[in-house]
């Protein structure tokens, strides 16, 4: 049940999760100038009962300097499979993660650990995303993608996250979030349908977009 | 000077998870954003050339996105689009249009 | 005026290569993703080109994208009849919060 791609790729936005559900693994990765032990485990996992989640295994990285190399130590190509990027950063605020069962907080860094953590995420994971500094969210809704399976296959759920650029020629200077207008149609609105026809195309999940026109007389 | 509003209904998706934006192409020209809806709480947004000309709106309970025009005018002819904003702000999946004629 | 600049037409014979350019600035094409769309004609518009240079499913090859610093194009090889069409760039402006598109591009399949 390991997730197949990437969690979705957010302009000018990164992604956090801020638990690991039990199955996730993270890839022990060194910084440049550094390899893992020879002993050393290969990835942590996130392990445990009904009661309680943990990591097994640690990461160990050592100096490199001995074997007349600095290159950052690879992953095997059946490592590369299912590679999940995070960078390195203070977590994001929206979820406790100390009381969700079934599982694992974040790793506590390792010494001389690489800058960006690869993880494999299983089904079921939520990962939550922010605008990068000097982006803010155009919608201050939630922003968040679910590993899900659906007819055998994984796939993220797309987050609806809009990152514009802080300009100063900005059209929206400290713009605040717009009253939601109400839903449903106005009373005075008489329907006179004019034209509807599908514009479909057809993908692994179709989506159809129809338009069609509706006519009042204006008093 | 007649008022008149437009649908778009999204089919095959979640529609109130994914931003809709209107694009209008006037007779042998080209395509222009004029604004988009979060149908899940009805955020809006507009473009500077179509703030107070045009109102957008959803209702989320019947998949579908409105563009309104409180007084038509003869400037207001073209071909009007609505297209789901999907993986990178792209505008993936497009409406098959519906063209407005304003006459006098 | 569109913000993005396209040239108005370009044309080719079959199994010629063309490249459409579009030229854009620092709040649009300088940070964001660059798009392209097909118009056929009498249709809505199609999305062509993702993320500056990624192909949709059902986007034939012969289709590719690229981007450098605030300009971007399309390249059509092996010009066939039926890519006769209107080719738009688009991309996201950060300075306006919004979508911004060149003027078209009109190519003819000689």
């Known amino acids: 049940e390991l997730c197949d791609d990437d969690p979705p790729e957010i302009p000018h936005a990164t992604f956090k999760a801020m638990a690991y559900k039990e199955g996730t693994m993270l890839n022990c990765e060194c910084k440049r100038g550094f390899r893992r032990i020879k002993s050393g485990s290969l990835y942590m996992l996130c392990t445990g009962n009904s009661s309680h989640s943990s990591w097994d295994n640690q990461c160990q990285c050592t100096s490199s300097a001995t074997r007349n190399t600095t290159k950052q130590v690879t992953p095997q190509p059946e490592e590369q499979k299912e590679r999940k990027t995070t960078e390195m950063q203070s977590p994001m605020q929206p979820v406790d993660q100390a009381s969700l069962p079934g599982h694992c907080r974040e790793p506590p860094p390792w010494e001389n650990e690489a800058t960006e953590r690869i993880y494999h995420f299983v089904v079921g994971q939520m990962v939550y995303y922010q605008c990068v500094q000097g982006y803010r969210a155009l919608h201050r809704g939630p922003a968040e993608s679910v590993c899900k399976m659906t007819h055998g296959k994984t796939r993220w759920t797309q987050p609806q996250l809009i990152c514009t650029g802080e300009m100063e020629t900005s059209q929206f200077p400290g713009e605040e979030k717009p009253q939601a207008s109400p839903e449903g149609r106005p009373e005075s609105e008489t329907s006179c349908l004019v034209t509807t026809t599908d514009f479909q195309i057809q993908t692994e999940m179709a989506a159809t977009m129809e338009t069609s026109i509706f006519t009042t007389e204006y008093q | 000077g007649e008022s008149l509003k437009i649908s778009c209904k999204g089919s095959g998706y979640s529609f109130s998870t994914y931003w809709i934006g209107w694009v209008r192409q006037m007779p042998g020209k080209g395509l222009e954003w004029m604004g988009l809806?979060?149908?899940?709480?009805?955020?809006?947004r507009y473009s500077p050339s179509f703030q107070g000309q045009v109102t957008i709106s959803a209702d989320k309970s019947i998949s579908t996105a409105y563009l309104q025009w409180s007084s038509l005018k003869a400037s207001d002819t073209a071909m009007y689009y609505c297209a789901r904003v999907g993986d990178g702000y792209s505008l993936d999946y497009w409406g098959q249009g519906t063209l407005v004629t304003v006459s006098s | 005026q569109p913000v993005l600049t396209q040239p108005p037409s370009a044309s080719g014979t079959p199994g010629q290569r063309v490249t459409i350019s579009c030229s854009g600035g620092s709040s649009n094409i300088g940070r964001n993703y660059v798009y392209w769309y097909q118009q056929l004609p009498g249709t809505a518009p199609n999305l062509l080109i993702s993320?500056?240079?990624q192909r949709p499913s059902g986007v034939p090859d012969r289709f590719s994208g690229s981007r450098s610093d605030t300009s971007a194009s399309l390249a059509i090889s092996g010009l066939r009849s039926e890519d006769e069409a209107d080719y738009y760039c688009?991309?996201?402006?950060?300075?306006?919060?919004?979508?911004?598109f060149g003027g078209g591009t009109k190519l003819t399949v000689l």
């Open positions: 688009a991309t996201w402006d950060d300075a306006l919060s919004g979508w911004v």
């Open positions: 809806i979060y149908p899940g709480d009805s955020d809006t």
């Open positions: 993320r500056n240079h």
